[in-house]
Every structure is written in C-alpha cells, then in structure tokens.
C-alpha cells in the first residue's frame, strides 16, 4: 500500500489551532514539478457534508512529502470530510478523514467501520443532545433510512446493514429531523472487496494474517498496518511516537501522538495512534491493553509485561507476541519484511536463524508463493546465528507475493513470511522528442511515457548514424533534463533510442522505439560583396557579385538577394538557386524607389553573412508607348519610320529611343535617340540592302517609357553594304513633301 498518512489534531479548544497534515513516505512524493511524482493534495470535500462558506483554508507545503491545512475559523469549519491524495499513477491513493462536531446532537460510537464483503455492519449513533424527532440516516448525502425517536436502544440509534457489498462503502450520517446537518453523527464504512482473510481478483488468495490490528488489502494482499506498527504482517512495533510504514515519521509536539487521529489508506481507515484511545485520542490505554485505539490485549505469559505502545515486553529467554516462545525454539532473525527484485533476475536471498540446538544449513528452507521449496546453496555459521543463502531461479511475475523462510530443529520451528515484489523494468512507449538541431548537435527530450515499473533511476540515450553498423554511442542522463548530443556530423540522420532503468540488478529495460533525427547543414561562412549593378529599366535591375576565393568545395546551395524598400517598409527576396551564379536580373521592382541591396550565401536553411549593403535608386516610370508606328523603305539603305505621340503624357517628352534589329539576327539590337521630341517621323540610314529589319520605339520623360509595337520592313535591293544605320528625322509633313 502507499505510505500515506493523514493526521488530524483533535485538541479542539480552539478551532484556529486545528490542523490536518498529510505525510507521504513515498520516494519523491509531492514534488509535482517533474513528471515522476504528482503533488500531494489535501482538501475539504464538500460534496456530501456542506458547511456554510467561510474564509478559504490555507495550504502549506513542508518539504516534498508533507502538506498541512490550517485556517479554520469556527467549529463548523471542521465538520465534514477531508481527503489527502498521494502516490503516482496506478498507486494514486486517497486517504479520508471524517470529522464530527463534539457538540453534535448525535455522536458516532466508532467513526470508521472496516468490514468484509458479506458481513453485517452496525453503525451506532449515541444520543448526545436528545430531540424527540425522527432520526434520518443518509448514505453519501442521500436519504437511506428513518428511525422513529422511540427506536433508540440504550441511548443509541443503530443502523444495521446486512450482507454489505463494496458499493455500500461511503460516508453515512445520522441526523435528527429538523436539525442542522452539522449536528449529525458522521461515519465511514469501508467494505473490503473480499470475504475475511482473502484477497485478489477472485478473492482466491489468502491474506498473510495481519497482526496488531493490521488490515489485509483486498487488491494486493499487503497488510495496512496501524500507526505505530511495521513489517509485512505488522509484527513489529515502532518506538513510541513514531509512525509510517518504516516508522520513519515522528509525531509532532512534546506529548507524542496524544490527541492525533491517524487515517491510512483503505481498507484501514482511521484510528488513534498506538497507546491512545477515546473520541479525541487523549486517553491512555487501560492496563493490559495496547495498540491503536487500545484495541489489543497483551495477555503476556512467562513474566512478560504489557507496554501500551508495543505489547508484551518479554524477559530474557522468551519471545513471541505473548512471550509464549522459549528462546530454545529456533527463531528467524532480522528478516526484511519486503524485498524487491527485477523480472528475470536470479537474486540471492539470505535467511538467518538462531536457536538451540543450533540451526544448520539443511534445517533452513525457502518457500515460494506457488509452494516450491528452495534449499540453501551455502550457509555461513557464526557463533550467534546461521545464515542460509538461497540462489533463486530466474524470477517471473508470478513469483510476486508472500515467500516464507522456515527453520526446523528438534527444538521446534519458526517461520517468517516476507513480501517479494517482482518489478518489470521500464520500457519506453515512445521515441524521444527532438527539441532543436544544429549542424553538429541535437537537443533531445528523453522524458517519455513507459510501461513497466518505476521509479526511473537512469535514462540512457543510444544514438548512431542512420543505416550505420557501427556501435551505438550511449549517454547517461538525468531523467528530468534535456540532453544535448554533441560532436555529430552535419546533414546526417541519426537513429536515437531511449533506454530506462529502475533500481536494482537487472533493472535495465528494453530499448524504446527508434526515431530519426537529422543534423542541420554546416553554416555557410563566406561573405559575398556586390561587384556592381545597373538599371535596365524603371523596374529592372541587374546585379553582380563575387565571393572570396578559398580552397576546397564551396559550402552553399545558392544566393539570397534582399532588397529593402525603406519607404514602404517592404522586403523583396530573390532566390538564386545556383552556387555558381554571380549575376541576377531583378524584375518587377517599383520605379522611382530607393532600395537597399545585399546578397548572402545560403546552405540548406542556413544563411551566411550578408554582403555590405548597396543603395540603388530606380528611375521613375516613363511615359506610355508611341502609337501607330509604321515603317516604309525609301531606298536600299534607308527606311522611314512614322508614329503618333503617346496619349495622356505626364509631362513633356525629352526624346524618343528607336530600337533597330535585323530580323532573325543573333546580335544585340541598336538603340538610336531621336533628340527632337516634337518630331513624328525619322529616317534610318546606313542600312543593308535587301535586308529585313525590326523596329520599335519608346519615349522618355524622366525615365524610359513602354515600347511601342514592333514593325518590320525590308530595304530595297542591290545596293552596296552600308556601314550601319544612322538616323535623320524631320516632321512627317516635311518628309511627305519631299
């Protein structure tokens, strides 16, 4: 069972001094900040017993395994149900405390009732302040039964519950009709899931025979020991004032555990500490009685004396619960009450015994839960004891349960049962998560859900390049921290797996599923510089750049050109996907705009250093295209062009530009300026005879405008080859006159 205790301080003279403390003896309990241990919760449960609202209660955490509830301002704040929740995962356990008002009309003779399935439970409410009205019994807040006030027997109202079943468990209350619910007697009924002395899914397993008032847990067969007792069967008493599964906790205050109620996981419930009794746990046990609530009787033999905390204290030469066993009878010594091993291990178990005659190797045997008897492989004989060592065959899950060490001599026999827990090493259910990556390192979160048993003692991360047959590299990490895998190869896939371990030999679990994590490319280091740029139009810019010469292959996939339009707050990015490129034409720019320009090398998703920036001013956009361009051959070397001025001009034209190109030719076109913008005609001279030419033109105001349509015309034949076209222009009318 989970080591969880809810302590209620019952010194009720002042509710403001009242407190509840929940103490966990579980490893890592209450930390809450990591995934391995949820926090302890301590709260009032108002679902069944509703009290008038008051100031909120104060919760204080004292270290990792203790939480205290204070801030009760009036007695009614105390009445009701409180619960503490602790333990992790499937072991998460709720411990419940029910508080009754000392001034209630009805008081419970006994608050906690633990009964077996099929038993008859009897709840008894004692009349404290009589009212001549009906008594209403409720179960978990809902009406359950009515008694006429005449039905009281010896000043008590009894509720008989025959053949109880686990669903009957819960909070019961007895209240006078017309009385405040706070004047009720509140009870807690715990119905074990099995009949007496049985546990397990089909109630087929036999309980270990819990001593000193311990209660056998119906799910796992463990004894839930009363406060002040320990051991597999609660056979050992703690020192006075101590509690917890290993007697590790100490009652607060100078008067020890006086005035404290202890609540433990079901099916135990609540009781006073060992040596105390009464509704407020302030009365010491009467002579001859001991234990929690003083429920146990000493009945010491052979001169033993009764200690109200631990029971019989035996004189020299005697031992046993009632000092009934002579020291001549062999006795198992210092056997651990609980041992834990990992699945498929082959542990060694030691069992020591003393007696007269002295036990020898063959007289000590070990019995497994399935009845198999193991004989010791060796024994160490010392003056005061013999220690037998047993080599246990490979453990399976079915070996979990109660084992027994037994010693037999002619002087008699003794046996000691102990619990063996076979734990399953943890196996990750998921692959680790990649958090960030660089060219030579991966940052990984190893924290994954797992099957099997905790706690997790170590986490190993195994990794190697994908498709590699080389040995795995391994790193041992803290379970709660992220891990950085370093000195990796860039642009390489790595197979990464988690392996979890729990404490003890053989606690390493199988490796979890692999995941592929890929390192980034190496960062490009070369810084380009801009060689130059020129404007090829109002919205076109040709840029060229260079890189420093370095030995070895170029680390890069291409270039990124960035143009920043500061006026509009816009960035234009142009990707040049060849690392060999050293020039690019940027089109679709905004005419008349001032750009800041830079270039940087990229590799995969990583960018190298940017070039020093350049500042470029694009000319404003030009006028519309001239209209109705027409070409007419005049001779074997002359062609006349005529046109109409563009429409909707934004200002006066400064010149026209004519583009001349031989049709089907591979050479660059020739551009000829017409510097008299009022002209609508020009003659292109110096052309080759019998040659077909293409013409188009555009106007310029502050910047060049759009091209006109292209026209074709051939010069007349059989002339001499000209030196090249030249231009002569005049008004169209004048040309026509000539």
């Amino acid at each position: 069972a989970v080591d969880l205790t809810l302590l209620a301080n019952l010194r009720l003279t002042d509710p403001q001094r009242f407190f509840l403390t929940c103490v966990s003896g579980e490893a890592g309990a209450g930390r809450g900040s990591d995934a391995w241990g949820p926090p302890l919760l301590l709260e009032k449960d108002d679902r069944i017993v509703r009290t008038p609202p008051g100031p909120p209660l104060r919760l204080a955490r004292n270290g990792s395994h203790q939480v205290t509830l204070r801030g009760f301002s009036k007695p009614s704040d105390l009445v009701g149900v409180f619960s503490c929740v602790g333990g992790a995962g499937a072991r998460r356990t709720r411990v419940i405390y029910v508080h009754n008002s000392p001034g209630a009309h009805l008081l419970p003779d006994k608050v906690t009732h633990t009964v077996n399935k099929g038993d008859t439970a009897v709840l008894s409410a004692r009349v404290h302040k009589e009212k001549q009205t009906d008594v209403i019994w409720k179960s978990n807040g809902s009406y359950f039964y009515t008694l006429d006030w005449h039905e009281a027997q010896d000043g008590r109202f009894l509720l008989q519950l025959p053949n109880v079943q686990p669903p009957s468990s819960g909070i019961y209350s007895a209240t006078y009709l017309e009385a405040s619910p706070l004047g009720s007697a509140f009870f807690r009924l715990i119905v074990r899931g099995c009949g007496a002395g049985r546990w397990g899914p089909g109630c087929t397993k036999e309980c270990p025979g819990c001593l000193h008032g311990g209660v056998c847990h119906d799910h796992d067969g463990e004894c839930v020991c009363p406060p002040g007792f320990t051991g597999t069967r609660c056979e050992q008493a703690c020192r006075e004032g101590r509690f917890g599964q290993s007697c590790q906790e100490q009652c607060p205050g100078i008067s020890g555990c006086r005035g404290l109620t202890f609540c433990l996981p079901d099916p135990y419930g609540c009781s006073c500490g060992s040596g105390w009794r009464g509704s407020q746990c302030q009365e010491a046990c009467a002579p001859g009685h001991f234990g929690a609530d003083c429920r146990l009787q000493c009945q010491c033999q052979n001169g033993g004396t009764c200690d109200r905390f631990s029971g019989c204290v035996c004189p020299s030469g005697w031992h046993g619960v009632h000092c009934e066993k002579s020291d001549r009878i062999p006795q198992i010594l210092n056997m651990a009450s609980e041992l834990e091993f990992n699945l498929e291990t082959m542990p060694r178990i030691n069992c020591a015994a003393a007696g007269n005659p002295f036990p020898v190797r063959g007289s000590i045997e070990l019995r497994k839960p399935d009845g198999t008897v193991l004989l010791s492989t060796k024994a160490i004989v010392e003056p005061e004891k013999t220690t037998a060592e047993f080599e246990v065959p490979r453990l399976v899950l079915a070996d979990s349960g109660f084992w027994e060490c037994r010693v037999s001599t002619s002087g008699g026999q003794d046996s000691r049962r102990f619990k063996v827990n076979v734990k399953v090493p943890p196996v990750p259910l998921a692959a680790p998560r990649l958090l960030t990556k660089q060219s030579r390192q991966l940052v990984v979160s190893p924290l994954v859900s797992f099957s099997g048993d905790g706690p997790i003692s170590t986490v190993r991360l195994h990794y190697r390049p994908q498709d590699s047959t080389m040995d795995w590299s391994t790193i041992v990490v803290d379970p709660s921290e992220n891990v950085t895998l370093m000195n990796l190869r860039p642009k390489t896939g790595y197979s990464v797996r988690v392996q979890l371990s729990r404490p003890g030999e053989g606690g390493e679990g199988a490796w979890g599923p692999p995941t592929l994590m890929t390192t980034d490319c190496p960062e490009p280091l070369l810084q380009p510089w801009l060689e130059g740029w020129h404007v090829e139009g109002t919205d076109r810019l040709r840029v060229s750049w260079s890189l420093p010469l370095v030995p070895g292959p170029l680390v890069g996939d291409g270039f990124l050109l960035r143009l920043w339009d500061g006026t509009r707050g816009q960035e234009r990015r142009e990707n040049v996907s060849s690392p060999q490129a050293r020039t690019a034409l940027l089109t679709g720019l905004t005419p008349g705009t001032h750009y800041q320009l830079d270039v940087q090398l990229y590799h995969c998703t990583l960018l190298g250093p940017a070039s020093p920036p350049a500042h470029v001013l694009l000319p404003p956009s030009g006028p519309p295209a001239p209209r109705h361009l027409h070409a007419q051959a005049l001779s074997d070397s002359e062609i006349q062009l005529t046109w109409k001025h563009p429409e909707a001009l934004p200002g006066p034209i400064s010149k026209y530009v004519v583009e001349v190109q031989v049709a089907g030719g591979a050479g660059d076109p020739l551009w000829i300026d017409v510097d008299r913008p009022e002209e609508t005609s020009t003659i292109i001279r110096g052309l080759n005879a019998s040659t077909r030419y293409l013409f188009r033109m555009r106007a310029s105001i502050q910047g060049l405008g759009d091209w006109s349509n292209t026209v074709e015309e051939s010069t007349l034949g059989n002339g001499l080859q000209a030196e090249g076209p030249v231009q002569e222009s005049r008004a169209a009318e004048e040309g026509l006159d000539q």
Epitope: I136, Y143, T146, L147, L177, A179
Partner: antibody, heavy 123, light 110 residues
Framework: EVQLLESGGGLVQPGGSLRLSCAAS????????MFWVRQAPGKGLEWVSR????????YYADSVKGRFTISRDNSKNTLYLQMNSLRAEDTAVYYC????????????????WGQGTLVTVSS | QYELTQPASVSGSPGQSITISCTGS?????????VSWYQHHPGKAPKLMLY???NRPSGVSNRFSGSKSGNTASLTISGLQAEDEADYYC??????????FGGGTKLTVL
Amino acid sequence: EVQLLESGGGLVQPGGSLRLSCAASGFTFSSYMMFWVRQAPGKGLEWVSRIYPSGGWTYYADSVKGRFTISRDNSKNTLYLQMNSLRAEDTAVYYCARVTVPLDSGSYYFDYWGQGTLVTVSS
Amino acid sequence: QYELTQPASVSGSPGQSITISCTGSSSDVSGYNYVSWYQHHPGKAPKLMLYDVSNRPSGVSNRFSGSKSGNTASLTISGLQAEDEADYYCSSYTSSSTWVFGGGTKLTVL
C-alpha cells in the same frame, strides 16, 4: 423507475371494512417511511397515517385513530391500510406516498405518489 | 377545515406570472422552513414541485419559484403555460410531527 400502485378501493356501507394495498417497485422499499394521504371529493389533501421502515412505529391522523391500521410487508414490497368502522366522511381517493429527505434538507417530503384508489362509503 | 389557507382559484394568460399564497401559523409555516408545493392534475399522481420553501427537485422547471414571509408562503409560476393548469397544494411540517395541507388552488390558464 419508482412506482406505487394502489388497489382495494370500492363501495362499502357505513360501518364496513376495506383493506387497501400499495405495491411498490423501483426502490429499496424497506428503507423508506410510507404514508397514506386522502382527498375527499372537491376537497384538499389530508394525511391519514404513516409507518416507519421497520414497521414497528405507526402514527395516525385524529380523524382515523382507532379505526384504521397501517402495516407493511417489506419482503413483498407492499404497504397496507386496514379501514374498519367506515364512515361517509371517509369517502375519498386514497393515495400511498413515499417520503424522502432531500440533500441539504432537514425534513421529509412526499417525492413519489401513486395514482390513488377511490373508496366510497355509502348506504 | 384545512390548517393552511389557499385561494380557491387563480387564473392567468399564457406568458404571464401568477402567485398562489398559503397562510398558516407559527406552529407550521412560520415556525419551519419545511414548506412544500405539489401539483395535481386530476386523475394523476400529485407531483412535488418545491421543497424547503424554495428548492426545486431535479426535473422541475425553473419557472416555478417559492418564497416565505412570516406565516405566508407563496408559489410563483412565471411564463405561464397551458400544461401548468392543475390544482396546487401547499404543505408544511408541524410542531406536532404531522403534516398539514392547504385546501388547494385551482389554476386556470386562460
């Protein structure tokens, strides 16, 4: 589903006797206090008698005391009302009713009623 | 003679609100907060509508509400609907550990 079904009503002469039954289902009959309530023609409701779950304690309205007897058989989930020395003023529809104590309440309320059975006392 | 006094009849149009009063004494209505109201359609079983003066059992519409002042308890039905037409009875626990009912009020939805 909680159900209460009365039977046994009918026409009877003054001074005569009748035994009413109420069959209960859908709840743990043996845990509940049960009532008989009646309604005379054109009149309001009037509580007649009550019996505690154990059957050991019974109470009656003054108008029927000494003439009517309430009883129950928890093994049969049935409530009874034995009516003797009937009078004309006992003519009414007789309802059996269950009481409960709602959460957070300190009193009983009639949470389920039967459809009623008519008793006519006339010569 | 009934120990709790109710008006014999009340009427209202659909959508309107109506209030039915129930007057008792210090030994019942004013002495306890244990007043309840029952709705009774003739030929059917009565139905608990309110308990502890103003609490509604689950399944009862929130159009039904209750209050108490001195020795008079009241049932208010808002947003009147045709199916609300029925007889309504108030009831109170008494100091003599008995129950008293009102004479009933016939609610007509016009």
